[in-house]
């Protein structure tokens, strides 16, 4: 199953990067899972995911840094808190989980930079 | 004349970005002129340029927006003043000027990505 | 480090049942598809069903369906294989694998036989 | 369901050499194919995923190729460790399945 995302984002200065991840859906799929990873070297990662029913909304859990919405094949993805060091290439996985078959499809990924900002001066 | 510079480079908060440009030089050259040209769409500007010579510092003009410094066949190149708006492709630019025969080298250009930083809050 | 141990293997008569286990530690077992794959004496590698995640969703291949379940307990970290109704071309070693992030089967346990005989 | 096909069944080979073996599959599977390496006795161990890329810590004379409906993967010289039952799998859709596997054995 083919997935789209963008080759390069740019996270703000506040660590926020915001991306679309589209899918080819072979089939009606009603229940989707979507996960991002994080590639660094050859070590792949587990960013965030979540499960979502088709026309309902995609939910991470709380604690994650990851929010989304989706609408028909297309979920859009924010990563919040990012730092420089978070700097690297974030891939979109989905999974079409039901009903049967289950298919999966991978993006080629999309490398988000992230810059730290610079401290404001004291208020004196 | 073969040209390296990278491929990607991010600009500091402060709107600073840095890259190294290589060059091959073919014979012994005395005087080399490095320009730093910005593409974007098919337009291609010129952004600034300096002349020097084998050994001598690297000296832009005064209101130009980069410095920078030679080392051997390395010029070490710094543009500020940058925004998100000038975020696009910088390609450096040689020629071997003098003695004959002239060579020109043009890298494949380096990617500057310019992220504006958040405004700090005003003091009371 | 990564383990995945299957157990509960053994003889049994056609018709009967078995449970295998498979115990996975060293990872969080609830972010990640699990497969059983099987392989019966001298031949290749046969799927026989996966698992995923919070166990909700699972697949099967033709050869087991309605006669094998899979299930998980992501609290124990283990993995199940119920088999009812086994059969003499059920007899092979069965393997727990886990399914990598990018989605092959990057680990895999030591197998168990299971012989299915009169 | 999808088939995939292998071949040649048996590679008989000397030590050094340059192994080169096909997967076919019956319908497109991307570029999620995987090639395992089992010896006699021994659990399956991945070698390569997304047809091309290297699993952790396998010895770079392991290469793999394709999309589509035709990969390959080559071991460009062979060493004696190597010499073992390949299998490809494609885990792109349910129901999964395996190609039925090539023996590499020393000639």
């Known amino acids: 199953m083919h997935v789209a995302q963008p080759a390069v984002v740019l996270a703000s200065s506040r660590g926020i990067a915001s991306f679309v991840c589209e899918y080819a859906s072979p089939g009606k799929a009603t229940e989707v899972r979507v996960t991002v990873l994080r590639q660094a070297d050859s070590q792949v990662t587990e960013v965030c995911a979540a499960t979502y029913m088709m026309g309902n909304e995609l939910t991470f859990l709380d604690d994650s840094i990851c929010t989304g919405t989706s609408s028909g094949n297309q979920v859009n993805l924010t990563i919040q808190g990012l730092r420089a060091m978070d700097t690297g290439l974030y891939i979109c996985k989905v999974e079409l989980m039901y009903p049967p078959p289950y298919y999966l499809g991978i993006g080629n990924g999309t490398q988000i930079y992230v810059i730290d900002p610079e401290p404001c001066p004291d208020s004196d | 004349m073969h040209v390296a510079q990278p491929a990607v480079v991010l600009a500091s908060s402060r709107g600073i970005a840095s890259f190294v440009c290589e060059y091959a030089s073919p014979g012994k050259a005395t005087e080399v002129r490095v320009t730093v040209l910005r593409q974007a769409d098919s337009q291609v500007t010129e952004v600034c340029a300096a002349t020097y010579m084998m050994g001598n510092e690297l000296t832009f003009l005064d209101d130009s927006i980069c410095t920078g410094t030679s080392s051997g066949n390395q010029v070490n190149l710094t543009i500020q003043g940058l925004r998100a708006m000038d975020t696009g492709l910088y390609i450096c630019k040689v020629e071997l000027m003098y003695p004959p025969p002239y060579y020109l080298g043009i890298g494949n250009g380096t990617q500057i990505y310019v992220i504006d930083p958040e405004p700090c809050p005003d003091s009371d | 480090q990564v383990q995945l141990v299957e157990s509960g293997g053994g003889v049994v008569q056609p018709g009967r049942s078995l449970r295998l286990s498979c115990a996975a530690s060293?990872?969080?077992?609830?972010?990640?598809?699990i497969h059983w794959v099987r392989q019966a004496p001298g031949k290749g590698l046969e799927w026989v069903a996966v698992i995923w995640y919070d166990g909700r969703n699972k697949d099967y291949a033709d050869s087991v369906k309605g006669r094998f379940t899979i299930s998980r307990d992501n609290s124990k970290n283990t993995l199940y294989l119920q088999m009812n109704s086994l059969r003499a071309e059920d007899t092979a070693v069965y393997y727990c694998?886990?399914?990598?992030?990018?989605?092959?089967?990057?680990?895999w346990g030591q197998g168990t036989l299971v012989t299915v005989s009169s | 369901e999808i088939v995939l096909t292998q071949s040649p069944g048996t590679l008989s080979l000397s030590p050094g050499e340059r192994a080169t073996l096909s997967c076919r599959a019956s319908?497109?599977?991307?570029?999620?194919l995987a090639w395992y390496q089992q010896k006699p006795g021994q659990a399956p161990r991945l070698l390569i995923y997304?047809?091309?890329s290297r699993a952790t810590g396998i010895p770079d004379r392991f290469s793999g190729s394709g999309s589509g409906t035709d990969f390959t993967l080559t071991i460009s010289r062979l060493e004696p460790e190597d010499f073992a039952v390949y299998y490809c799998?494609?885990?792109?859709?349910?129901?999964?399945?395996f190609g039925p596997g090539t023996k590499v054995d020393i000639k």
């Open positions: 060293g990872f969080t077992f609830s972010s990640h598809g």
């Open positions: 319908q497109s599977v991307s570029s999620y």
């Open positions: 997304g047809a091309s």
């Open positions: 694998a886990r399914v990598a992030p990018l989605g092959p089967l990057d680990y």
């Open positions: 799998q494609q885990y792109g859709r349910s129901p999964f399945t």
